[in-house]
């Protein structure tokens, strides 16, 4: 899609990366909010979950998400046959048996009920960004990140390294 993209070029092999072990290295229960401090909330509607990005009223309780961390080997992009290093991947679960999924065809982020082992669409490369923020890159679609669009979560293509710090793909994790 983005032939000139450094991010795309480098991470085109993300889907070939191997999760080292099927057990998470650690888990973390946190609230998820945007760079602008809007909360990510989850609501059960018609037997399915909807994801919202909204301002909470004062003292309103934030929804929590269970982040499960996985260590993953990254294949070398130049030759395709070597290991270029390690990265951290996460899955995000706001409630039992439901996980955030990347729907690359619809460019959407959805909550799906599924059993383990989880599909690749539920895995995201966790990026440690400036200003105590993180970003989530799709394992199945390198160069595509979870972002905020029209008060919903969506998949956003990042076409250059400069855009990695675009505010709409930056999120904050908090224990409170």
């Amino acid at each position: 899609a983005f032939g000139i993209s450094g991010v795309q070029k480098y991470t085109r092999a993300l889907h070939d990366s191997s999760i080292t072990g099927i057990s998470p290295i650690t888990e973390y229960l946190a609230s998820l909010s945007t760079y602008n401090d809007q909360s990510i909330t989850f609501a059960l509607e018609d037997e399915s979950y909807e994801i919202y990005v909204e301002d909470l009223k004062k003292d309103e309780k934030k929804d929590k998400v269970l982040l499960s961390y996985y260590e993953s080997q990254h294949p070398s992009n130049e030759s395709g046959d070597g290991v270029d290093g390690k990265m951290l991947m996460v899955t995000l679960s706001p409630t039992k048996d439901f996980w955030l999924h990347a729907n690359n065809k619809e460019h959407s982020v959805e909550l799906h009920k599924c059993e383990k082992p989880l599909p690749d669409q539920a895995f995201f490369v966790l990026h440690n960004m400036h200003s105590n923020c993180v970003s989530f890159e799709c394992k199945t679609d390198p160069g595509v990140f979870i972002g905020v669009k029209d008060n919903h979560l969506a998949l956003i293509k990042v076409d250059s390294s400069e855009n990695l710090c675009t505010e709409n793909i930056l999120f904050k994790l908090s224990e409170t």
Epitope: V7, Y10, Y28, E78, D84, G85, L88, H127, E162, L173
Partner: antibody, heavy 119, light 111 residues
């Protein structure tokens, strides 16, 4: 193969300037955060400066703020460290380092280049 | 800044013995539920090499005899059975916040 090769070190007088370079190969340079870490002779390691992928953010250790500038040229796959107002205590081997993909730790290191500040 | 204190300064052991190195942080290095404490090995005339990241995860190509443990402020690097090539200086380092800091190092020498 992922490689980092530093150059530009040498002998310089106190108050002088030097520019270090780090040529990167074997990976898509622009996607990674890069740093300089130094080691004085017979001493431990000290982080000096970091620049994010995309050149958006830079950070420095207090002792070099206002004197050193980290920069990168993604078109040349090269990291730089411009060092001005050099002091004797800046004498060290300077290592270029690449973060892992996702920017959580220093994963790849160059062989280093020696900077000696002396009159 | 976060100060990392390593002990002992020097460890004198024989090949085949178990080495236990300690690193203590002046405050927690936890962030996002991860312990952002890394271990490096350095041999004379060589650059450091990543051994362990996020307290307990081995870097690429690192032998299984190296293991890391700990959380919060107290961390340990263990070499289960020392090989001749393991005699070197070991540094812990925190990547929780700027300035990124290193411990002063532990030298593992042949007894």
């Amino acid at each position: 193969e992922v490689q980092l090769v530093e150059s530009g070190g040498g002998l310089v007088q106190p108050g002088g300037s030097l520019r270090l370079s780090c040529a990167a190969s074997g990976f898509t340079f622009s996607s990674f955060s890069m740093s300089w870490v130094r080691q004085a002779p017979g001493k431990g390691l000290e982080w000096v400066a970091t620049i994010s992928g995309g050149k958006t953010f830079t950070d420095y250790v207090d002792s070099v703020k206002g004197r050193f500038t980290i920069s990168r040229d993604d078109s040349k796959n090269t990291l730089y460290l411009q060092m001005n107002s050099l002091r004797a205590e800046d004498t060290a081997v300077y290592y270029c380092t690449r973060a892992n993909y996702g920017n959580w730790f220093f994963e790849v290191w160059g062989q280093g280049t020696l900077v000696t500040v002396s009159s | 800044e976060i100060v990392l204190t390593q002990s002992p300064a020097t460890l004198s052991l024989s090949p085949g013995e178990r080495a236990t190195l300690s690193c203590r942080a002046s405050e927690s290095v936890a962030k996002y539920g991860l312990s952002l404490l890394n271990w490096f090995q350095q041999k004379p005339g060589q650059p450091p090499r990543l051994l362990i990241f996020a307290a307990s995860n081995r870097g690429s190509g690192v032998p299984a005899r190296f293991s890391g443990s700990g959380s919060g402020t107290d961390f340990t690097l263990t070499i289960s059975s020392l090989e001749p090539e393991d005699f070197a200086v070991y540094y812990c380092q925190q990547s929780k916040e700027v300035p990124f800091t290193f411990g002063q190092g532990t030298k593992v020498e042949i007894k």
